[in-house]
Structures are given as C-alpha cells and as structure tokens.
Interface confidence: medium
C-alpha cells in the first residue's frame, strides 16, 4: 500500500534571466527511493539514481544543475521555461510518487517567489 505523500514548492515565479530551485519532498513512507526523475511536460530534464548518481539531459546541461539535495536548479531562465514540472519518485516497494510544480517566468524585475519548505 502506498502511504507516502509528496510535498512540492507549488506554484512559483521567477525573473527572466534568474534561477530557481525546484523541490519535492517525499514523506510518510520508509520506502527506498531508487530514482528521482525531473520532467518538464514531456521532456526529461534530469535523473538522480541511487546507485548511478545524476544524469542531466544533454539539451539542458548548460542551464540545469543538480541539487541542492534531490532538488533541481534551473538557471538563465527564459519565458519559454514557464510551465509544469514534475518530480517522479521511483520507490521500492511502494511504486511511483509524482509531484507537480508550476513555474511562471516573469519579464518584470519583481517576481514573487513561492514559500520555501519550513524545517521543523
């Protein structure tokens, strides 16, 4: 039975040319995380595999950095980066958990950022 839940940074916005950290958090399960995929709509951005480490898709290598932690940092943002991003946690024995983040890249010099996770 899948007992875990995914928390995400939710809807976030950032300035054109800036950078943003995408974060998801899997909680309430002791399942082994074997791999985390980061996807933008139908494109694979990056994979973090427990045994093989990080792989960044070649087309995003210049603008995507792994981390912090299992998160993903997007750099040199353009308006075309606006859209849905998904973190896909592959776990054993639970299966797959998916979180969704919507990023809006703004032209203006003032962008309101989504709330960061609070640490207990």
């Amino acid at each position: 039975m899948m007992t875990g839940t995914i928390e995400t940074t939710g809807n976030i916005s950032a300035e054109k040319g800036g950078s943003i950290i995408l974060q998801c958090h899997l909680s309430s399960t002791t399942a082994q995380v074997t791999q985390v995929n980061w996807e933008q709509q139908d494109q694979l951005l990056a994979i973090c595999n427990a045994d093989l480490g990080w792989h960044i898709s070649p087309s995003f290598k210049d603008r995507v950095a792994p981390g912090p932690g299992l998160g993903l940092t997007l750099q040199s943002l353009t308006v075309n980066d606006t859209g849905e991003y998904f973190c896909i946690y592959h776990t054993y024995p639970d299966g797959t958990y998916t979180g969704r983040i919507f990023l809006e890249v703004l032209e203006s010099s003032v962008a309101e950022h989504g709330a960061r996770f609070q640490i207990p």
Epitope: E7, I21, Q23, C24, H25, L26, S27, S28, T30, Q32, V33, T34, C48, N49, A50, D51, L52, G53, W54, G67, P68, G69, L70, G71, R116, F117, I119
Partner: nanobody, 115 residues
Framework: EVQLVESGGGLVQPGGSLRLSCAAS??????MGWFRQAPGKEREWVAS???????WYADSVKGRFTISADNSKNTAYLQMNSLKPEDTAVYYC???????????WGQGTLVTVSS
C-alpha cells in the same frame, strides 16, 4: 521504527578537523544527507550521499567536507576539515527527501569552532 543517531561533535579550533557519524537503525535509506543549523539561523543543507557512493555538497563546504556512507554498517559520515568559526552549528543527519526537508531526523550533534 527508524532512528538516526549522530555523534562526533565537539569543540575544535579554527583550521581543525572533526568526523561526524550517523548511525541508522530500523531501515537504511538510498539517500542520506547532512544538514546544519547555526544559532538564530534556518537549518541548511550541507551534503548528500547516494547509495552508490555519489556525493554532492553545498558551496560553502565544498573542498573542505567529505560525506561518505558505509552501507554494511548503515552509517553515514561527515569528515570536516579546515573548519571555520562560521561552521559552528548543530549538525543533523537525515533521510533525504529533498534539499531542505526530511521526515526522519537525528537529534543533532553540536560542533563549535572557536579558539
């Protein structure tokens, strides 16, 4: 029940070294992380290690700290060299959920860097 127990903290002079250990019982995890919280500041991510031995670090500790894990002992380590006063904090190990959040935390071990 999952338990994470840190040890190895203490008082050290600037430029000195310490090795922290984090023993996991009840369940091992594919991703382990070290975090720290300085007085009056938010908890911050320090370093992570994957089951396969892959590691990554916060910029502030890169080149000075080394994270590792012994899967057979269910233990993660943080070797801290060239310590600075600004490294003073309570250090926590955690099951990685992301860069800043985890649902399994240890109780922390205090590292004080002072002359």
């Amino acid at each position: 029940e999952v338990q994470l127990v840190e040890s190895g903290g203490g008082l050290v002079q600037p430029g000195g070294s310490l090795r922290l250990s984090c023993a996991a019982s009840g369940r091992t995890f594919s991703f382990m992380g070290w975090f720290r919280q300085a007085p009056g500041k938010e908890r911050e991510w320090v370093a992570s290690v994957l089951r396969g031995g892959y590691t990554w670090y916060a910029d502030s500790v890169k080149g000075r700290f080394t994270i590792s894990a012994d899967n057979s002992k269910n233990t993660a380590y943080l070797q801290m060299n060239s310590l600075k006063p600004e490294d003073t904090a309570v250090y926590y190990c955690a099951r990685e959920g992301s860069g800043y959040a985890s649902d399994y935390w240890g109780q922390g071990t205090l590292v004080t860097v002072s002359s």
